[in-house]
């Protein structure tokens, strides 16, 4: 089938990085600058993606592959193929319409993106609080008393509630 197709369609012989040029008797012409074809048999080359503004080039465009973008420092990628850049926040914050805001008490965010999430509720697993949470870090749950064995760390009672963001050192 492939052989039959190639006899009927000379374009199928054009490799990636070229296109089948109808204006030149269907011969294989190299992709012009700033364009690419990632598969063989293409009748046109695709325009290279340009990484401008908040986007920066992570991988240059070649004749056979598109450029790849990521985000400038202070921003992170969102969407397939880094289609958008979103502002970073500090750990312990989340991005709102009004900019980066500290996590409310009882919530945390240990990343520079995403939302503040409620601390883990240790009691749901029948465990106790080993380390209190902060706005940057989740609570750490300790083993239930029945789980303790020689060599395991003992469960310390929860310390008085801290202001969010005051990390226990």
């Amino acid at each position: 089938f492939e052989r039959t197709r190639s006899l009927q369609d000379p374009c199928s012989n054009c490799p990636a990085g070229t296109f089948c040029d109808n204006n030149r008797n269907q011969i294989c012409s190299p992709c012009p600058p700033n364009s690419f074809s990632s598969a063989g048999g293409q009748r046109t080359c695709d325009i290279c993606r340009q990484c401008k503004g908040v986007f920066r080039t992570r991988k240059e465009c070649s004749s056979t592959s598109n450029a790849e973008c990521d985000c400038t420092p202070g921003f992170h990628c969102l969407g397939a193929g880094c289609s958008m850049c979103e502002q970073d926040c500090k750990q312990g914050q989340e991005l709102t319409k009004k900019g980066c805001k500290d996590c409310c008490f009882g919530t945390f965010n240990d990343q520079k993106r995403g939302i503040c999430r409620p601390w883990t509720n240790c009691s749901l697993d029948g465990k106790s609080v080993l380390v209190n949470g902060t706005k940057e870090r989740d609570v750490v749950c300790g083993p239930s008393p029945a789980d303790l064995s020689p060599g395991a760390s003992s469960v310390t009672p929860p310390a008085p509630a801290r202001e969010p963001g005051h990390s226990p050192q």
């Epitope: 520079k112 380390v131 750490v140």
Partner: antibody, heavy 127, light 110 residues
């Protein structure tokens, strides 16, 4: 007992591809973050990538970003690492590691460390 | 060059106490939990300390972890020959959006 068994390592030429697998047993695979960590012969441990079970979020070390892809199949209790455009510096023993802190109850696993490790699979990149 | 700095080597005689340091920054150790791993020759790493200072069950209480500011320490008391291994600190780094390891400290029991 937690068991992690890596496979798929071998000799590959620079620029080539390889897919590593990690078969997990002895725990509820779908409830835990999973990472790949590598170690070049005689060198330090280097974290490569992590995948979360709940939202499928993935993170990568800068050294592999855009070349490696981590994935998981919770129905098969298997973790994968697709490695493309391999370089000489990617040669290492690759370990599959289970994080502590079962999700969704636990919101973040970073406190609990990697409490289960496989024995590793060797990746050699050479022409 | 690792984001977390550990001394390449440490040593001690049996029965004594040795401390291994791990230095980082506010984006990693300063605001995140530190974990420690032991790697015996030719084997996979093993979790030794989690959440800065807590031991998983089965880890002897000779091993203890602590943290102050942007530095962490692992102390091993009552040193034994079987403690001879590489010790790694690790934590999450929010600015890198990933985990980071120190380059390890090789402990020799003299």
């Amino acid at each position: 007992e937690v068991q992690l068994l890596e496979s798929g390592g071998g000799l590959v030429q620079p620029g080539g591809s390889l897919r590593l697998s990690c078969a997990a047993s002895g725990f509820t695979f779908s409830g835990y973050d999973m990472s790949w960590v590598r170690q070049a012969p005689g060198k330090c441990l280097e974290w490569v990538s992590v995948i979360y079970p709940d939202d499928g979020n993935t993170y990568y070390a800068d050294s592999v970003k855009g070349r490696f892809t981590i994935s998981r199949d919770n129905s098969k209790n298997t973790l994968y690492l697709q490695m493309n455009s391999l370089r000489a510096e990617d040669a290492a023993v690759y370990y599959c590691a289970k994080h502590g802190g079962q999700k969704p109850t636990t919101k973040s696993s970073s406190a609990y460390g990697m409490d289960g490790w496989g024995q590793g699979t060797l990746v050699t990149v050479s022409s | 060059q690792s984001v977390l700095t550990q001394p390449p080597s440490a040593s001690g005689t049996p029965g004594r106490r040795v401390t291994i340091s791990c230095s980082g920054s506010s984006s990693n150790i300063g605001n995140n939990y530190v974990t420690w791993y032991q790697q015996l020759p030719g084997t996979a790493p093993k979790l030794l300390i989690y959440a800065d200072s807590h031991r998983p069950s089965g880890v002897p209480d000779r091993f203890s972890g602590s943290k102050s500011g942007t530095s962490a320490s692992l102390a091993i008391s009552g040193l034994r020959s079987e403690d001879e291994a590489d010790y790694y600190c690790a934590t999450w780094d929010y600015s890198l959006s990933g985990y980071v390891f120190g380059c390890g400290t090789k402990l020799t029991v003299l």
